[in-house]
Structures are given as C-alpha cells and as structure tokens.
C-alpha cells in the first residue's frame, strides 16, 4: 500500500509462493533455500523465482517445487510469534542477475534504518486490489517502544515494526513471508498487522536476526553431505 512498481528484477531474492495462486512471498537465502513466514505454511508449495509480473511469463522465471517445508518448532498461530518458515527447493536455483540470494543479518535491526519491503500483496488499505507487478516500498525501522505502543501486549522480542505511524504506506495481505532488507541484509519477514496502512498500526515483521542460528542449523541438518572415510 502506498508503494511503487519495482524496477524489473531489481529485487532478485524475492520469490512468490504459489499453490495454484500467489499466496505469500519469500526470500532466497541460498541456491536451495528460501525463508518465508510460518503462517504461509502449506503442504505443497511451488516457489517462483525471477518473477516480476506474476500473471505473465516474461522469460526469467524459475519454477521449483518445495522439497521440504520446515516451520519453526515454536511457531504460534495465535500470536504469530516465531513466524518463520524454511523451504528447501527440490533443485538448486540458477543464480544470475535476476535471481540471487540475500544475506542473513549480522546485527539486529536498528531504529531509523531505511529498508526495502516488496511483494505482490494488496495495494489498498480499504478493499482489495492485487497487483500483477512486484511492488516496492521504502520504509524506516521503528523503535521497539513505538512498536509496542502500537500493539500493546502483542509484540514479542522476535518481532519489530517498520513503516509510518501516520499510515498510508505498509505491507498488506499477500506480502507475508516477503523481505525487509536493510543495507543488503534480510532483517525482516512480512508477518502481520491490524489492517494495512492504518494510523498507529505499522506493519509487524519477524526479526530474522534472532533466527540466524536456527536457519543455519536447519539447513545443515537437511543438507545431505556424503563423507567418505
């Protein structure tokens, strides 16, 4: 909501999760792994990489089925705490200028830092209009105090807010699982909010920094390396 059409393939780590229709976004973090939101879990997912217009085959797409879909063991569907999911692709993505991985964070998100949020979610704060072309939004990371004041009792240490307290610009339904990137690092995953782009209701995002170890451990545990002794 309140964003702009991204320059074509300018967000090369952005993926669309498809189950017959686009239902969530995600981020490519290595040639065979995608991170998304826990509440985007489905039993079968096709990962679509290199997308810009999701309704048109433009020639740069890679469609790869999920081989493994791993939701965080402490995901809470009621509070959306630990709202993170890992997807192992059935075959590695071909990395090129239009499809490439985003780095995991080396430090937690800092208030005031500019970030890029992207996705194919609803572009209206009232009603619905789902775009075909990838939308981008530049937005600042808010302080934890502002975040907690916006959603009293709902914000855990695994969440942070990004956006504008005045409303008008935000992620929305269909953006879940997608990236929040600051300084070339994946700081957030689109998670939840009360409505979209409402005053004093900024978007809430999963704090990826808290899950770097879980991500690395999960990837290691689900990668088949054959050691010959």
């Amino acid at each position: 909501v309140g964003g702009y059409i991204c320059e074509e393939n300018s967000v090369p780590y952005q993926v669309s999760l498809n189950s017959g229709y686009h239902f969530c976004g995600g981020s490519l973090i290595s040639e065979q792994w995608v991170v998304s939101a826990g509440h985007c879990y489905k039993s079968r997912i096709q990962v679509r990489l290199g997308e810009h217009n999701i309704e048109v085959l433009e020639g740069n797409e890679q469609f790869i089925n999920a081989a493994k879909i791993i939701r965080h063991p402490k995901y809470n569907s009621r509070t959306l705490d630990n709202d993170i999911l890992l997807i192992k692709l059935s075959s590695p993505a071909v990395i090129n200028s239009r499809v490439s991985a985003i780095s995991l964070p080396t430090a937690p998100p800092a208030a005031g830092t500019e970030s890029l949020i992207s996705g194919w979610g609803n572009t209206l704060s009232s009603g619905a209009d789902y775009p075909d072309e990838l939308q981008c939004l530049d937005a600042p990371v808010l302080s934890q105090a502002e975040c907690e004041a916006s959603y009293p009792g709902k914000i855990t240490n695994n969440m942070f807010c990004v956006g504008f307290l005045e409303g008008g610009k935000d992620s929305c339904q269909g953006d879940a699982g997608g990236p929040v990137v600051s300084n070339g690092e994946l700081q957030g995953i689109v998670s939840w909010g009360y409505g979209c782009a409402q005053k004093n209701r900024p978007g809430v995002y999963t704090k990826v920094y808290n899950y770097v170890d879980w991500i690395k451990d999960t990837i290691a545990a689900n990668s088949h390396h054959h050691h010959h002794h």
Partner: antibody
C-alpha cells in the same frame, strides 16, 4: 445483503460448451474472489475453480483443460465456460463468494465460501 | 490432489444426542479446513472455517477441531433442524470436499 443468481441454458448437447453466468446483487463484485462448484444428483460437491475481479484464475487441475472463467465488473457478473461436455458434466452448478483474510496475518488465505447462489441444473443430453 | 475422507457416510441419532463426524486429509493441511451444512434442494452453508472458527450467525452447538490431517466436527445437542448432509472442505492446495455425512433423526 449480497445475493448470487446463476443463469444459463438448462440443457447442453454432448461435445458442446456449457456457459453459465453468476450475477451479484446487493453488493459489489469488486475486491472479492468468486468460485464455481458443481454437484451431480445425489453426489458430493466438486470445486471447478475461482476467479478474482482482476481476472486472475485458479482452476481444478482435473478440469483445467476445459474450463474458462471471466468477470465483468461493469455488470457485476462472472461467468463459467466448460467445453467438450459429456453426460458426466450433468449437475447442479453453484456460484459462491470466497471468504478471505479474516486474521491479522498478511498471507492470502481463504476461509470457505460464505455466500452461495441457489444453484442451476444443467443436463448434458442429445 | 489432496483427498478428504469423511466418516461415517451416514448416521442416525436422537434429538439431544452429541454427534461427531471426522474428516481425514491425505496429507498435512495445517488448519485449512472448513465445514458446511447442506439441506435437501438447497445450497451448502458455511458453518466452520479455519478448522475451529464458528461462522457469524451459526449456533454454538456446532464446533470443529483438529489440525494437520485429522479433523472433527461436532453437534453438541442434535436438533431437528440439523437434519442435513455435512461436508468438510480443504483449501491447502486447490479445493477438495469430503464425500459428505448424511445426518438423520432416529
């Protein structure tokens, strides 16, 4: 409140195309997903597909090669075409509205079909 | 396709009885499960969405539970107006319905 009304020929010849229209009254067709479902006499329900008001579609894989859905927002209508019909396509055809995004999570979620038409019987016979 | 196996296919119970219907998915569908009631000659009516949430205006004697592959639909105290066929429906991938359970009064 929103009401749906299916319309179209009650009799279609084998190998021809079945065409049905659903008219939405009491509310706007815009900003919603809409589905078609069918039910052969005395049998269960089969989902045919859904369409969003932008024209984006999602079809049952078993029927995909024969199904076309379209939407006309100016008339508050959406339509179904099913080609190469046989006697097995004889059924009551329903249109329905898909319920989406109740919660605060930002995925696209469907929560069932909350408004249905009364259904129209289509018989495939020569 | 995800198969939905509903049981029993029919049942007969007395007014005031507790009625339970089960639905099993062929694979994990999380909570992408809805329940409908269909009376003869009528369109289906949504009762429960997201496995356990009661649709607006539906009597509280109807309830649903479950997650993953196994789901349950319950009528806590069967009423004469509950005579109908009940269907489960998944929306994890595309949409499929269970075969239905016909509920009759003894």
């Amino acid at each position: 409140q929103v009401q749906l009304q299916e319309s179209g020929p009650g009799l279609v010849k084998p190998s021809e195309t079945l065409s049905l229209t659903c008219t939405v009254s009491g509310g706007s067709i815009s900003s919603y997903y809409w589905s078609w479902i069918r039910q052969p006499a005395g049998k269960g329900l089969e989902w045919i597909g859904r369409i969003y008001t932008s024209g984006s579609t999602n079809y049952n894989p078993s029927l995909k090669s024969r199904v076309t859905m379209s939407v006309d927002t100016s008339k508050n209508q959406f339509s179904l075409k099913l080609s190469s019909v046989t006697a097995a396509d004889t059924a009551v055809y329903y249109c329905a509205r898909d319920l989406t995004n109740y919660g605060s999570g930002k995925s696209i979620r469907f929560y069932g079909m909350d408004v249905w038409g009364q259904g129209t019987t289509v018989t495939v016979s020569s | 396709d995800i198969q939905m196996t509903q049981s029993p296919s029919s049942l007969s119970a007395s007014v005031g009885d507790r009625v339970t219907i089960t639905c099993q998915a062929s694979q994990d569908i999380s909570n992408y499960l809805n329940w409908y009631q269909q009376k003869p000659g009528k369109a289906p009516k949504l009762l429960i969405y997201d496995a356990s949430n009661l649709e607006t205006g539906v009597p509280s004697r109807f309830s649903g539970s479950g997650s993953g592959t196994d789901f349950t639909f319950t009528i806590s105290s069967l009423q004469p107006e509950d005579i109908a066929t009940y269907y489960c429906q998944q929306d994890d991938n595309f949409i499929t319905f269970g075969g239905g359970t016909k509920v009759e009064i003894k």
